[in-house]
């Protein structure tokens, strides 16, 4: 090929929109952290586009991502956590876009886990729990939750609950009785880290009781 | 105008500790790096610590590790260098820098001298 043809290549390359976003995940297995980017227009030919990442890493000057289907990622030990890096869009070593970002404030957590709803009778609640792998992390511990429950008949009517713990509360006497419900959760960074919700747990399903009338109630 | 100003430097017995401090002027000081460097006579300059933005993460050389704590107060816009075992070989000024952007400290203080006699 010529390199009269590479140039134009270029020159094409050049009037694209190659807008990307990114997000990190913090020691994602064991010491290992991640980088994830894609391209903000999804019909971008990515034929022949790179990524690569430099500054604020240890040992190293430049990491290259690997390349997925669409999306572009790097696992490794290597990222400083301190300081700006340069993540780059690149074509034939030249760069065509490039964004400065500290990869502590562009952090994904993992999605919670293990949801699960027990009804208290001699309460009249349900007690909301689930799991985070972030307990166990030394970095992203500090985490804020948003529970959202819907009556599974209301499509889009979630009601939401933020908390920083990993346990909740529904009083009964807020929810229909004798009603299915759908509830789910995800996190995002609080306090020393910055970024981006999580993936939504799996849902968990619970019917509500119907309500018992005391004797000498009347229907 | 001086944007980064050190201070708490001073004669020191080997064994004793000193707190340094660099107050920032520059206004993204609560969301850029800040380090410690420090340069002995006749060396280069050499790093000591470095804190995020935060302060949730940290990286010391080996040569301060366990000895040095590297800390910052971002509503002071502060960044602190505590320091003991303080040794001989820990003479020199010693300079904090500002916003890690690529590998480059965009912005360095005057340095404050810290001497530590046997």
């Known amino acids: 090929e010529s390199g009269y043809a590479q140039n134009g290549d270029l020159e094409d390359a050049e009037l694209d929109d190659y807008s990307f976003s990114c997000y990190s995940q913090l020691e994602v297995n064991g010491s290992q952290h991640s980088l994830t980017c894609a391209f903000e227009d999804p019909d971008v030919n990515t034929t022949n586009l790179e990524f690569e990442i430099c500054g604020a890493l240890v040992e190293v000057k430049c990491l290259s991502f690997r390349k997925l289907q669409e999306i572009y990622f790097i696992e490794t030990k290597k990222f400083l956590l301190i300081g700006k890096s340069n993540i780059c869009v690149k074509v034939g070593g030249k760069s065509l876009t490039c964004k400065k970002i500290d990869l502590t404030t562009i952090v994904k957590p993992e999605a919670p886990f293990d949801l699960s709803v027990i009804y208290r009778e001699g309460a009249n609640d349900f007690v909301v729990t689930f799991n985070t792998s972030h307990l166990q992390k030394k970095y992203v511990k500090v985490l804020m939750h948003d529970v959202a429950y819907r009556q599974e008949k209301d499509e889009n009517k979630w009601m939401h609950v933020n908390l920083s713990s990993t346990k909740l509360t529904l009083l009964q006497r807020n929810l229909q009785p004798e009603a299915m419900y759908e509830i789910k959760v995800r996190s995002i960074p609080d306090h020393y880290f910055k970024g981006f919700w999580s993936e939504w747990s799996p849902s968990y399903y619970f019917r509500t009781p119907e309500i018992n009338n005391s004797p000498g109630e009347m229907d | 105008e001086v944007q980064l100003v050190e201070s708490g430097g001073g004669l020191v017995q080997a064994g004793g500790s000193l707190r340094l401090s660099c107050e920032s002027s520059?206004?993204?000081?609560?969301?850029?790096?800040m380090g410690w460097f420090r340069q002995a006579p006749g060396k280069e300059r050499e790093f000591l610590a470095a804190?995020?933005?935060?302060?949730?993460?940290?990286h010391y050389s080996d040569s301060v590790k366990g000895r040095f704590t590297i800390s910052r107060d971002n509503a002071k816009n502060t960044v602190y260098l505590q320091m003991n075992s303080l040794r001989a070989e820990d003479t020199g000024r010693y300079y904090c820098?500002?916003?890690?952007?690529?590998?480059?400290?965009?912005?360095w203080g005057q340095g404050t001298q810290v001497t530590v006699s046997s």
């Open positions: 804190i995020g933005w935060s302060g949730a993460v940290t």
């Open positions: 520059i206004s993204t000081f609560s969301s850029d790096a």
């Open positions: 820098a500002e916003d890690y952007d690529t590998d480059v400290w965009q912005y």
